[in-house]
């Protein structure tokens, strides 16, 4: 079924990832700026 | 901070393997682009792998490049290097001020 | 793949005055555009994020503005450390068949 394929390979193909994560401080704790997931 | 290494003078069609290697950091938590710039050059985006390991190549770097990481390092492979891959190779934490300095490639006969 | 468009390639202008730079994108990229400052033999430097939004310690000086596929850097009261080439960033998502990394072509600064 598609959702055991969905879950198999973990999201459907050619699908858009979310953006790069901006990491705005240059600090190595820093938090990445939030961005919603495109799946 | 980020440090490339392993650039140096190669042959045309010799495979050459670049490594950068994060201080305070572990590479493996983030997003880490590849990019390029030939001398007097732009910049010039190769490929990235997100933190969750998935890579992404440019479709002129496709088959070209191999990105892939381990626990302490993300590796480069330029597979068979032309005259045109001449260029200072940078590594990058996703899109910030964490750059390191950058290595020369130079593929010359 | 984003291409990115930018122009102009050189630009001139005296200390005090203000210099704007565009970059185009192929398709939209929403707000996921950033600005750099590159300077000979360094790396490029982080201006601003978001389109729009300052990185830590950069001066006001610097706007970047735009969303979708049209975006600005203005550069205003220039000084002579503004001299730099200028590079616009999309940092869009990919997906297995689009990469929605790229670089603009690059901006010269000179200033008078």
């Known amino acids: 079924s598609y959702s055991m394929e969905h879950f198999r390979w973990g999201k459907p193909v050619g699908k858009k990832r979310r953006p790069v994560k901006v990491y705005p401080n240059g600090a190595e704790d820093e938090s990445a700026e939030a961005f919603p997931l495109e799946f | 901070s980020l440090e490339e290494s392993g650039g140096r003078l190669v042959t045309p069609g010799t495979s050459l393997t670049l490594t950068c290697t994060a201080s305070?950091?572990?590479?493996?938590?983030?997003?880490i682009l590849w990019v390029r710039q030939a001398p007097g050059k732009g910049l010039e985006s190769i490929g990235m792998?997100?933190?969750?390991?998935d890579t992404y190549y440019a479709t002129w770097a496709k088959g070209r490049f191999i990105i892939s990481r381990t626990s302490t390092t993300m590796d480069l492979k330029i597979i068979s290097p032309t005259t045109e891959d001449t260029a200072t190779y940078f590594c990058?934490?996703?899109?910030?001020?964490?750059w390191g300095q950058g290595t020369l490639v130079t593929v010359s006969s | 793949d984003i291409v990115m468009t930018q122009i102009p390639a050189s630009v001139e202008a005296a200390v005090g005055g203000t210099v704007t730079i565009k970059c185009q994108a192929s398709q939209s990229i929403d707000s996921s555009l950033a600005w750099y400052q590159q300077k000979p033999g360094q790396p490029p430097k982080l201006l601003i994020y978001?389109?729009?939004t300052l990185a830590s310690g950069v001066p006001s000086r610097f706007k970047g503005s735009g969303s979708g596929t049209e975006f600005t850097l203005t550069i205003g009261d220039l000084e002579c450390a503004d001299a730099a080439t200028y590079y616009c960033?999309?940092?869009?998502?990919?997906?297995?068949?689009?990469?929605?990394?790229?670089f603009g072509g690059g901006t010269e600064v000179v200033v008078k």
């Open positions: 792998m997100y933190d969750d390991g």
């Open positions: 960033q999309s940092y869009d998502g990919s997906s297995s068949s689009y990469y929605g990394i790229g």
């Open positions: 978001s389109a729009s």
């Open positions: 305070g950091f572990s590479l493996s938590a983030y997003d």
């Open positions: 990058v934490k996703g899109v910030s001020n964490i």
